[in-house]
Interface confidence: low
């Protein structure tokens, strides 16, 4: 992926819109489209003040780990969806899009250098608090987490990483 493609805000905006659309669709289905089990996902809440006070390496860890956890969660929901006869087939399209989107975002962030920043220097990773997680038991919750993660930590991180690259 071109190194600074994600710095074009329209790119991230496209994924955010897809996530919001999926969230809206799943809001309308029975019980939020139950997954039948709890899937671990990152806590997307951003305390802006704390975020600004912690170093870039810590941000990178939170974003990289969050993206990995979200990817696992979306793949798990994809598997659950494939084995379920109770969930509408139209949802499969949104889950597939999200799986594909998370893969693309991972590549774009890797190109931006988030992976290197997340593992070096080692102090950044070791001093970072363990990633806070929550449980999602419906597709609606899962897509809300996905949407909030993109609009929150990912948007904040790419903003500062792209600005650093501009200097």
């Amino acid at each position: 992926a071109p190194a600074r493609l994600i710095c074009d805000s329209r790119v991230l905006e496209r994924y955010i819109l897809e996530a919001k659309e999926a969230e809206n669709v799943t809001m309308g289905c029975a019980e939020g489209c139950s997954l039948g089990e709890n899937i671990t996902v990152p806590d997307t809440k951003v305390n802006f003040h704390h975020w600004k006070k912690s170093e870039a390496g810590r941000h990178a860890v939170e974003v990289w780990q969050g993206l990995a956890l979200l990817s696992e969660a979306m793949l798990r929901s994809q598997a659950l969806l494939a084995n379920s006869s109770q969930l509408p087939e139209t949802l499969q399209v949104h889950v597939d899009k999200a799986v594909s989107g998370l893969r693309s975002l991972t590549s774009l962030l890797r190109a931006l250098g988030v992976q290197k920043e997340a593992v070096s220097p080692p102090e950044a990773a070791s001093s970072a608090a363990p990633l806070r997680t929550v449980a999602a038991d419906t597709l609606c919750k899962l897509f809300r987490i996905y949407s909030n993660f993109l609009r929150g930590k990912l948007k904040l991180y790419t903003g500062e990483a792209c600005r650093r690259g501009d200097r």
Epitope: R10, E13, V46, F48, H49, R151
Partner: antibody, heavy 127, light 108 residues
Framework: QVQLQQSGPGLVKPSQTLSLTCAIS??????????WNWIRQSPSRGLEWLGV?????????DYAVSVKSRITINPDTSKNQFSLQLNSVTPEDTAVYYC?????????????????WGRGTLVTVSS | SYVLTQPPSVSVAPGKTARITCSGD??????VEWYQQKPGQAPVLVIY???DRPSGIPERFSGSNSGNTATLTISRVEAGDEADYYC??????????FGGGTKLTVLG
């Protein structure tokens, strides 16, 4: 419904300290999901964020660079209020001062939005 | 320091659509809010998180944010929409986070 009631003098002499208080009802100053701000507005500077305090297992604050050396914002948990002190004021500090509540760690998407405001207090700095 | 730039004034006829812009370096990578302020009153939040409306704000108010520009769109403008509108962004708490404001005049 959150309500913010402001109080304090409307006239302060140059070089003295401007002191305002914001009493909170419908929420707690020690809330783990809210933040409490002071913002001012003048014809020359427009709307200007001054500073914030918030509680997340301990108290934190952030202040605007423009006033950092002169400002203090303190909570008063016993009265469920917070205060602004601005030292060494000059006529440039003449403005309408607002207290406001923002939500930096609660609902995703409302990380910074000032959803509730006090009515504002016009403070004139003049001898 | 981070600067948000707004046009000083925008005029629109009743029933038409008003668009107020707010520009800042790389603004699309931040959340943007919009506030409405009528004379003698405190500002009121009308849009947060680029495009979301707080409860009680009419659907006529919408927002977008991409590239270097955020836009507040007010469709089917009414006389009561006449006010000053301010954009704000949390680019940095330590910088001035408000735009200079735009006076919306409803013609007629």
């Amino acid at each position: 419904q959150v309500q913010l009631q402001q109080s304090g003098p409307g006239l302060v002499k140059p070089s003295q300290t401007l002191s305002l208080t914001c009493a909170i009802s419908g929420d707690s100053v020690s809330s783990n999901t809210a933040a409490w701000n002071w913002i001012r507005q003048s014809p020359s500077r427009g709307l200007e964020w001054l500073g914030v305090i918030y509680y997340r297992s301990k108290w934190y604050n952030d202040y605007a660079v423009s006033v950092k050396s002169r400002i203090t914002i303190n909570p008063d948990t016993s009265k469920n209020q917070f205060s602004l002190q601005l030292n060494s004021v000059t006529p440039e500090d003449t403005a309408v001062y607002y207290c406001a509540r923002s939500v930096p760690g609660g609902d995703p998407g409302l990380e910074h939005a000032f959803a509730y405001w006090g009515r504002g207090t016009l403070v004139t700095v003049s001898s | 320091s981070y600067v948000l730039t707004q046009p000083p004034s925008v005029s629109v006829a009743p029933g038409k659509t008003a668009r107020i812009t707010c520009s800042g370096d790389n603004l699309g990578t931040y959340y943007v809010e919009w506030y409405q302020q009528k004379p003698g009153q405190a500002p009121v939040l009308v849009i947060y998180d680029d495009s979301d409306r707080p409860s009680g704000i009419p659907e006529r108010f919408s927002g977008s944010n991409s590239g270097n520009t955020a836009t507040l769109t007010i469709s089917r403008v009414e006389a009561g929409d006449e006010a000053d509108y301010y954009c704000a962004s949390f680019a940095s708490w330590s910088d001035s986070v408000f735009g200079g404001g735009t006076k919306l005049t409803v013609l007629g």
